[in-house]
């Protein structure tokens, strides 16, 4: 499988909720010995590799913001911890997973990375990355909804 980002750029007015999304495309290994681990973090546009550096999102590290599932086990996430920081993690059965930042401020602006790790017993882990930019516009009068687009596109789509 691979990880894609439906949108590479989110522009949000201050005070709105921003939902950033990644999508797993292609078949995911099934079985009791397979675990899929998903997480989020802030990064910087590194010279060598995008998403290499891992910085916290609202003081929560990528370790705090994980969800994982595999075998016959349900998703596991530090839900309460995330909510206390105005964050929400979500995942569906179609490969989509997202992080929502509530009441965004300009300090939330940056390069967000999703990381998916496929773990199989006795196999080295496989890593898959996705990245997207969040730009938060200061001031309450800068629009009412977040706009999501691909940077190369001129059209933009209103995101939830």
């Amino acid at each position: 499988f691979k990880v894609t980002t439906p949108y590479s750029l989110y522009v949000c007015p201050e005070g709105q909720n921003a939902t950033l999304t990644c999508r797993i495309l292609g078949p995911v290994s099934k079985g009791h010995d397979v675990t899929i681990y998903k997480t989020w973090y802030l990064s910087s546009r590194g010279e060598v590799q995008m998403c290499s550096e891992r910085r916290p999102i609202r003081n929560l590290t990528f370790q705090d913001l994980h969800l994982h599932h595999g075998g016959h086990q349900a998703a596991n996430t530090s839900h309460d911890l995330a909510q206390r920081h105005g964050l929400e993690l979500a995942s569906d059965h179609h490969g989509n997973f997202s992080i929502t930042l509530r009441n965004v401020t300009p300090r939330d602006s940056g390069l967000y990375c999703c990381l998916v790790i496929e773990l199989k017993n006795h196999h080295p882990e496989q890593r898959f990355y996705g990245s997207m930019e969040l730009q938060v516009q200061a001031g309450k009068g800068s629009g009412s909804t977040c706009m999501a687009s691909n940077e190369q596109d001129s059209d933009s789509i209103t995101a939830a």
Partner: antibody
Framework: EVQLQQSGPELVKPGASMKISCKAS????????MNWVKQSHVKNLEWIGL????????SYNQKFKGKATLTVDKSSSTAYMELLSLTSEDSAVYYC???????????WGQGTSVTVSS | QIVLTQSPAIMSASPGEKVTMTCSAS?????MYWYQQKPGSSPRLLIY???NLASGVPLRFSGSGSGTSYSLTISRMEAEDAATYYC?????????FGSGTKLEIK
């Protein structure tokens, strides 16, 4: 505050078995793998194996299969390593360390010194 | 298994001096990790994913490399940097450590 508290030093006789504990606190135990590392007197570090508290899955260094058995007790957030049929070559300091998936061992226990001697 | 060879085995540096140590892998690895260990203490994570500083690590430390050749650099040696440094790989089972570089202060 993240802490990994290991059990105390052990002096054991050759042929005996023993179990080292590693109590985790200050983080979500099931979000990490617990790794065990041996450091012998020549100071080399050797990875023994790991266990995932999330699903109980284990992976071992082939060298330590049959020598070490890894288990966890999720209810007490404690990882265990049992060392079997000890010989003088097993005398070493043993560390537990947590590792987030796709990362490194960022917190280590203080180490448990094991001396095998008659 | 992947063998990690560190060189030099022992080195010494004066305060303020630039220090570089290397880690050579017998097969290509995706990322390298570096740990610092002082006598009587547990190892401490310094560098993750080849070049990123772990939390709380001073900016004078840096890592670089790819494939089979990696290095750890201290831009200006300080007395507290005297320790043994280990490289480590997670790319292939069994996960392995280098034999260490012992760094002493002159």
């Amino acid at each position: 505050e993240v802490q990994l508290q290991q059990s105390g030093p052990e002096l054991v006789k050759p042929g005996a078995s023993m179990k080292i504990s590693c109590k985790a606190s200050g983080f979500s135990f099931t979000g990490y793998t617990m790794n065990w590392v041996k450091q012998s007197h020549v100071k080399n570090l050797e990875w023994i194996g790991l266990i995932s508290p999330y699903n109980g899955g284990t992976s071992y260094n082939q060298k330590f299969k049959g020598k070490a058995t890894l288990t966890v007790d999720k209810s007490s957030s404690t990882a265990y390593m049992e060392l079997l049929s000890l010989t003088s070559e097993d005398s070493a300091v043993y560390y537990c360390a947590r590792r987030a998936y796709g990362y490194a061992m960022d917190y280590w226990g203080q180490g448990t010194s094991v001396t095998v001697s008659s | 298994q992947i063998v990690l060879t560190q060189s030099p085995a022992i080195m010494s540096a004066s305060p303020g001096e630039k220090v570089t140590m290397t880690c050579s892998a017998s097969s290509s690895v995706s990322y390298m990790y570096w740990y610092q260990q002082k006598p009587g203490s547990s190892p401490r994570l310094l560098i993750y994913d080849t070049s990123n500083l772990a939390s709380g690590v001073p900016l004078r430390f840096s890592g670089s490399g790819s494939g089979t050749s990696y290095s750890l650099t201290i831009s200006r040696m300080e007395a507290e940097d005297a320790a043994t440094y280990y490289c480590q790989q997670w790319s292939s089972y069994p996960f392995t450590f280098g034999s260490g570089t012992k760094l002493e202060i002159k």
